[in-house]
């Protein structure tokens, strides 16, 4: 990276807490907390299923798929009213992420 800042390189994130709840059948709820050092015009988001700094415009317009939140090979679709997104795996399994 052309410029480093503090312990976290500018534009990068690290996961500091993760929680999974598998108590419900056929459904796993995962929550993750990350620390990010985002540069001007960016905000913490998700890229390739990992915390990342993304353009603030994406969050503002709720064009979540522009973050490239899904893994390679998956398809991304916005949820109705842009409350989040789905990642569809080649086999048809769907992972849904809602933004709160």
């Amino acid at each position: 990276q052309f410029l480093k800042e503090g312990q976290l390189a500018a534009g990068t994130c690290e996961v500091i807490a993760a929680h999974r709840d598998s108590s419900q059948p056929r459904r796993t709820i995962a929550r993750q907390t990350a620390r990010c050092a985002c540069r001007k015009g960016q905000i913490a988001g998700t890229t390739r299923a990992r915390p990342a700094c993304v353009d603030a415009r994406i969050i503002k317009t709720k064009q979540w798929c522009d973050m490239l939140p899904c893994l390679e090979g998956e398809g991304c679709d916005l949820l109705i009213n842009r409350s989040g997104w789905t990642c569809t795996q080649p086999g048809g399994r769907i992972k849904t992420t809602t933004v709160s």
């Epitope: 990276q1 410029l3 015009g41 390739r48 990342a52 798929c65 522009d66 490239l68 090979g73 991304c76």
Partner: antibody, heavy 113, light 110 residues
């Protein structure tokens, strides 16, 4: 997974030309797609990018000269009013936060009167 | 607007190590990528995020970064490494997004 450009040909100055990049084996909804050109004997020149939402950005020098649009499996680049300086090989490239890891072989555009 | 400067040409002896540099005229907060292009072919991604190598790229190729300079190092240069090498980085965000290539370095292996 592959990309292939088409539409390159000899055109006269001022005649609009549309190039098409066809994607195979992956979904455009999970990548950024860019157009890059290379004049004969010169370096690479980024033209612009289209996000999965259809949002586009262009190099400062390319604004107003090019238009990028996308469909389900294709990304188009329109050269609105070609000049001789637009003679080049045009590449489409698939990118994400890790750089542009997949490129098409390129299509040659020659602008001449 | 960000400008990336590369030496136009560099020569290296077969089996030797060579470093190609890419200098930004202003400090950028974005990662550098490196591309290799052989005559008549499309570019190939060699290094992303300053130091990472895509699968399939030999570990003879490595990247580093310090200050406003990114460096591509080729250890044990081979005849097949003769090509043009381009550095690139994104510049700006939001409504001002740009992707910038350096002018390229032509590497000759003798």
């Amino acid at each position: 997974q592959s990309l292939e450009e088409s539409g390159g040909r000899l055109v006269t100055p001022g005649t609009p030309l549309t190039l098409t990049c066809t994607a195979s084996g992956f979904s455009l909804s999970t990548y950024y797609m860019s157009w890059v050109r290379q004049a004969p004997g010169k370096g690479l020149e980024w033209i612009g990018i289209v996000y999965p939402s259809g949002t586009t950005y262009y190099a400062n020098w390319a604004k107003g000269r090019f238009t990028i649009s996308t469909a389900s499996t294709t990304v188009d680049l329109m050269i609105t009013s070609p000049t001789t300086e637009d003679t080049a090989t045009y590449f489409c490239a698939r990118g994400d936060s890790f750089g542009y890891g997949l490129w098409g072989p390129g299509t040659l555009v020659t602008v001449s009167s | 607007e960000l400008v990336l400067t590369q030496s136009p040409s560099v020569q290296v002896n077969l089996g030797q190590t060579v470093s190609l540099t890419c200098t930004a005229d202003t400090l950028s907060r974005s990662y550098a990528s490196w591309y290799q292009q052989k005559p008549g072919q499309a570019p190939v991604l060699l290094i992303y995020r300053d130091t990472s190598r895509p699968s399939g790229v030999p570990d003879r190729f490595s990247g580093s970064s310090s200050g406003n300079t990114a460096t591509l190092t080729i250890s044990g240069a081979q005849a097949g490494d003769e090509a043009d090498y381009y550095c690139a980085t994104s510049d700006g965000s939001g409504s001002n997004y740009q992707y910038v290539f350096g002018g390229g370095t032509q590497l000759t292996v003798t």
